[in-house]
Structures are given as structure tokens and as C-alpha cells.
Interface confidence: low
């Protein structure tokens, strides 16, 4: 079949302490999120088809003003990466919230079947769960 | 035919007072903007083919410095949503200008024939009309 | 063949003084960057197939804090444009670092065979060469 694997996820929850990962959910029953090809494994997105993907993300911090992001010595940072298998672990996309409350970006990257993507939010601020403010998606674009 | 519906629009003008919507225009005679499938209805983008779309936007505020965006108690906010039909009204993408003068983001979302997308800019600051600073587009990616 | 031209590049180096261009590199030997169709000409991306492309970029400034971007009268600015042939020279995408250390955006634009894209970074701050912080890519999406 045509490799039209695609997913758009909404935030489910943050991890327990010492776990910087964001946990995602998707499906039409939840609103406008969906998984068509990729799958979720304990809230993390797993790729099922090799290819080049467009990965995109937006994360908005909750209860946030420019002073709340600037007052910390270490800025809050969001990193998207392959976290398993361990042999392919790498950071794909990284942004810091410098006096801002939202980050948004996208990139093209090769991904392989079985790659699990993690989105790590480091810092003390929490992400918004509003589905128009925080979302994460991938789109297969070519073999 | 292959569902290659796609559009990239440039800002035409803002709405009259009490109307937060941005009004868009597109077409090769205007420069690098175009509509191939979707159409404009009084400056708002209307979808003509069902499917999953990548929606993207960049808006740059005019007469803007980091102090002009931070000095307001309520930050200037940009929201992209389905505004008609009313039964499908929803906010798809929302960002605030916290000490910044540009927002840019993108997301995947299911859209249906007849959905009209609105881009609401709330606050007292004006958007730049430069075509490399403010633009809005959609791209059909799969059924 | 299907017009699946696509490229994702990583920063190689900045230009000599008076040359605001960023110089890019790509290829699997370098990591996760690649060129499949487009080519590099002295570090600048050249298009080889006519069509509408999604152009995306993220640039993160090195040794940067919100004070370093805000202290300059003229903010550091990133512009992506067609720089040759001269007859098609135009700015496609422009963002300033207002109290932020990263810009990221994307847009759809028609490009023609032979168009060379330049990414001009004006200001005194330098970009990070980390491949998850600074990257530039294009994706052919339709004729």
C-alpha cells in the first residue's frame, strides 16, 4: 500500500518525577488526533514503516508568562528524539523556551520501523493539555 | 484526480473593529501565493476536498519590538480554527506572542469539504503585510 | 519519475565577513542530513525540479540568552530567499530573534529548476552547528 503513514497526537500527561517524557494519546474519539500507521506504546510514538518523515511539534507551557520562562537559570527545553532502540538513540529536534511560552518546529528525518520517538521536556514548567496549543505529529513523505 | 489540493495565501487586510479575523488573498498575479483546489470566500479559506491537511501559518507583528508585545496585560494571540459550518467550529492552532514579534507553527488536521478556516488575531498590534513575514497555507496530504 | 525531490541539510559554516549566508552540507555520512534531487553549490541549495515546495528551517543561535538577542538595536534576522538567478531574486521567509534564541518556520512556495536558495543571517550572533538545533530543508509537494 502507499506509505501514507501519518499521526497527530495530543498530550495525555507528563511523566512521573525523573521521567522528562511527555505521554501522548490519539484517536478520533479524543478529538482531532489520529494514528494511521504509527502506533502508541505506553504514550510514546512508534514508527511502523521505513522512510523519510516530516516530524512536527508544538508545545505550550501552562500558567506561563515571559517572566516565568526567563526567571529560571536553566531554560525549559523540549527535545524530540529516537529513544529506542538504544542503538539508534539520537536527538532530532531541540528548542528552548527563552522568554516565550510556546515552541513550534518541524523537520525532515529518516525513520525506521520500530523507532520510538520520545519528547522530553526538561524544567519545572508544565505543558498545556489544550489540543490547539500542544500537539505532536509525523507524516511519511517518501521511501 | 489526485487530491493535491494546496494553497498559500498572503495577507490582504485586517478586519474592521470588532472583527478579529485576518483577510487573505492569493493568486500568481499577487506574487508567490496561489490557490489550487481550496478557494477564498470574503478573504477566508474554504476547503473543497475531504482529507487530512497540513495547516501552517506565520504571522509577524508590525511596529513591533519585544517591549511592545510584553507591555500588554493580555498578550496578542493568533488562533486558526474552523469557523463555519458552526457545527464544526473549533480552534485548531493557537499561539501567543510572548515578548516575540513572530509566531510560526503547523499541524496535521482532518478537514472536510465546506470547512472555512479563520485566523483570528486578538490584541491591539497589527500584522505585517510583507509576504515573507506573514502567510497562511494548507496542503492536502492524504484521504 | 515521481517528483519526490527532498533535502534536509545541516549547517557547515558561516560565510566570511560581509557574506551573511549560511553554508550547508548534507549526506548520510554526516548524520541525518540528505539530498535526494536537489544539490549543493558551494554550500547553497539548488533546485533541480520545478514545482511547489515546502521549505522549512530552524536556526538556533549559539552562546545565546534572551538578553544577548534583546541588547542589539537591530535584531538578528534570518531570511530565506532565492538568490540566483538574479531575475528571480526574492525573499521567501523572514524572521527576527526578538528575545529568543531559536527561530523555526515553514512555507509553501513555487520553485523552478536552477533556483538557488540562500539563508542570510544578519547580526553579530553566530548559529549553533548542533544538528538538532539548526537545519534547513525542502520537500517537493506537487507540480
Amino acid at each position: 500500500s502507499l506509505g501514507w503513514d501519518i499521526a497527530e497526537l495530543q498530550l495525555n500527561h507528563t511523566g512521573p518525577q525523573q521521567d522528562p517524557r511527555l505521554y501522548w494519546q490519539g484517536g478520533p474519539a479524543l478529538g482531532r488526533s489520529f494514528l494511521r500507521g504509527p502506533e502508541l506504546d505506553k504514550g510514546q510514538l512508534r514508527i511502523r514503516r521505513d522512510g523519510i518523515y516530516m516530524v512536527h511539534i508544538q508545545v505550550t507551557l501552562a500558567i506561563c508568562s515571559s517572566t516565568s520562562t526567563s526567571r529560571h537559570h536553566h531554560p525549559t527545553t523540549l527535545a524530540v528524539g529516537i529513544c529506542s532502540p538504544a542503538s539508534r538513540s539520537i536527538s532530532l529536534l531541540r528548542l528552548s523556551f527563552h522568554q516565550g511560552c510556546t515552541i513550534a518546529s518541524q523537520r525532515l528525518t529518516p525513520l525506521a520501523r520500530g523507532d520510538t520517538l520520545c519528547t522530553n521536556l526538561t524544567g519545572t514548567l508544565l505543558p498545556s493539555r489544550n489540543t490547539d496549543e500542544t500537539f505532536f505529529g509525523v507524516q511519511w513523505v517518501r521511501p | 484526480s489526485l487530491g493535491w489540493d494546496i494553497a498559500e495565501l498572503q495577507l490582504n487586510h485586517t478586519g474592521p473593529q470588532q472583527d478579529p479575523r485576518l483577510y487573505w488573498q492569493g493568486g500568481p498575479a499577487l506574487g508567490r501565493s496561489f490557490l489550487r483546489g481550496p478557494e477564498l470566500d470574503k478573504g477566508q479559506l474554504r476547503i473543497r476536498r475531504d482529507g487530512i491537511y497540513m495547516v501552517h501559518i506565520q504571522v509577524t507583528l508590525a511596529i513591533c519590538s519585544s517591549t511592545s508585545t510584553s507591555r500588554h496585560h493580555h498578550p496578542t494571540t493568533l488562533a486558526v480554527g474552523i469557523c463555519s459550518p458552526a457545527s464544526r467550529s473549533i480552534s485548531l492552532l493557537r499561539l501567543s506572542f510572548h515578548q516575540g514579534c513572530t509566531i510560526a507553527s503547523q499541524r496535521l488536521t482532518p478537514l472536510a469539504r465546506g470547512d472555512t478556516l479563520c485566523t483570528n488575531l486578538t490584541g491591539t498590534l497589527l500584522p505585517s503585510r510583507n509576504t515573507d513575514e506573514t502567510f497562511f497555507g494548507v496542503q492536502w496530504v492524504r484521504p | 519519475s515521481l517528483g519526490w525531490d527532498i533535502a534536509e541539510l545541516q549547517l557547515n559554516h558561516t560565510g566570511p565577513q560581509q557574506d551573511p549566508r549560511l553554508y550547508w552540507q548534507g549526506g548520510p555520512a554526516l548524520g541525518r542530513s540528505f539530498l535526494r534531487g536537489p544539490e549543493l553549490d558551494k554550500g547553497q541549495l539548488r533546485i533541480r525540479r520545478d514545482g511547489i515546495y515546502m521549505v522549512h528551517i530552524q536556526v538556533t543561535l549559539a552562546i545565546c540568552s534572551s538578553t544577548s538577542t534583546s541588547r542589539h538595536h537591530h535584531p538578528t534576522t534570518l531570511a530565506v530567499g532565492i538568490c540566483s538567478p538574479a531575475s528571480r531574486s526574492i525573499s521567501l521567509l523572514r524572521l527576527s530573534f526578538h528575545q529568543g534564541c531559536t527561530i523555526a518556520s515553514q512555507r509553501l512556495t513555487p520553485l523552478a529548476r536552477g533556483d538557488t536558495l540562500c539563508t542570510n543571517l544578519t547580526g553579530t550572533l553566530l548559529p549553533s552547528r548542533n544538528t538538532d538545533e539548526t537545519f534547513f530543508g525542502v520537500q517537493w509537494v506537487r507540480p
Partner: antibody
């Protein structure tokens, strides 16, 4: 340093035509809206026309609509104003003006040329 | 008939303060008219001073300030200098896409 240098003015009879040019330097021409503003002798300023950075969108004052055409060549950093069916009331100093690019519909003129004189008389 | 109104002329002493106003023939000036002020000295092109009601353009001395008061836009020069003798034009945004200029105020700095 931003420089705008106008040329092409002169004496022309009513009903005649003139083509004004403006050579721009010292800035990235292709990212700015450009304008023509005129000033009749001993009078105030009047906005005449503007063109967007790509050259696709143009606007005109009612007083010149249908007679004047603004255009630009981003490769050559030039702005032009083709003036047809000239009238005595078009007599003025014509300035080439850069729009600061600050807003979507409020021209703010941050750089001006020295002007070129147009006289329409028989 | 001018839509945008200005005093034809005003006089100020060196070091003194003067306020130039810019009104609408019918109606009040508000921030959504985005008042802009230009200075023109004899034989020179106009120069941008103030935009967006009260934002000084780069390089403009701090003695120039803009505001809206009593339904008019105002340009105040505090501590006038001899070199401030010039004609001052205001511009208001009234309808997309054009601006309307006032007739100009000739300011004389009398020593």
C-alpha cells in the same frame, strides 16, 4: 545607507506621458513595499501609489487611478511610475519612498528620495 | 477640503515647548488612525519622526513626543532647538490602503 534616487521628471504637455524611475540601494529592496508620494508647489504631501514587495499588489490614490501604473524590478532594485494622460494638477515633486514594512495597511514612510520634478503645462 | 487638519503655523521660543495637533474634519482621532509625523526642512525630503501615535523613529531626539489628546493627535517638542524650524506633516490612516496627510504646520523658532 539607504539611498533612493529618482529620475525621469520634466516638462510635459497635458495628455502626455512620463515614466519616473527610482534606483534603490543600501537595503534589501525585495522585502519592502515601495511608494510614490507627491508634493505640489507650496502644498502638502499626497500619497500616490504603492506596490508590495513581490510586485503583485498595487494600490492607487483615486486622483491617479487608471492613469498611473506602478511597477518594480527586484533584480535591478528599481521602482517605476508610468504616468499617462497627465493633467496640470499632476504638477508636483514626486518622491520615491520606502515603506518601513511595519503594518498590513498603514504606510509609514521611513526613507525618501530627493524627488523628481514633473511639470504639466501647455 | 482637507480631511486631516493642522494649524497652518505656530511659533515657539528656543528652549520652549510647543504642541502641534492633527485632527479629523469630522470625527475623533484614535490610535487606530495610527498617527504619523514627518518633518520637512526647506529644500529637503520629509523625514519620519513619530509613528504609531508615540513611537520615535530611530535617531529622532527625545524632545519629540507623540500622543493623542482631546480627540486629536499631538506632536510635542519639549525644549525646542533652532534646527526644529521646519514644516511638520501628520498622516492618518483612514481607509485601506492609503493615508491622508494634513496640510502641514510651519513651525518658527523665534529667538
Amino acid at each position: 545607507e539607504v539611498q533612493l534616487v529618482e529620475s525621469g521628471g520634466g516638462l510635459v504637455q497635458p495628455g502626455g506621458s512620463l515614466r519616473l524611475s527610482c534606483a534603490a540601494s543600501g537595503f534589501t529592496f525585495s522585502v519592502y513595499y515601495m511608494n510614490w508620494v507627491r508634493q505640489a508647489p507650496g502644498k502638502g504631501l499626497e500619497w500616490v501609489s504603492d506596490i508590495n514587495n513581490e510586485g503583485g499588489t498595487t494600490y492607487y490614490a483615486d486622483s491617479v487611478k487608471g492613469r498611473f501604473t506602478i511597477s518594480r524590478d527586484n533584480a535591478k532594485n528599481t521602482l517605476t511610475l508610468q504616468m499617462n494622460s497627465l493633467k496640470p494638477e499632476d504638477t508636483a515633486l514626486y518622491y520615491c519612498v520606502r515603506d518601513a514594512g511595519y503594518s498590513n495597511h498603514v504606510p509609514i514612510f521611513d526613507s525618501w528620495g530627493q524627488g523628481t520634478q514633473v511639470i504639466v503645462a501647455s | 477640503q482637507a480631511v486631516v487638519t493642522q494649524e497652518p503655523s505656530l511659533t515657539v521660543s528656543p528652549g520652549g515647548t510647543v504642541t502641534l495637533t492633527c485632527g479629523l474634519k469630522s470625527g475623533s482621532v484614535t490610535s487606530t488612525n495610527f498617527p504619523t509625523w514627518y518633518q520637512q526642512t526647506p529644500g529637503q525630503a520629509p523625514r519620519l519622526l513619530i509613528y504609531n501615535t508615540n513611537t520615535r523613529h530611530s535617531g529622532v531626539p527625545s524632545r519629540f513626543s507623540g500622543s493623542i489628546s482631546e480627540n486629536k493627535a499631538a506632536l510635542t517638542i519639549t525644549g525646542a532647538q533652532p534646527e526644529d524650524e521646519a514644516e511638520y506633516f501628520c498622516a492618518l490612516f483612514i481607509s485601506n490602503p492609503s493615508v491622508e496627510f494634513g496640510g502641514g504646520t510651519q513651525l518658527t523658532v523665534l529667538s
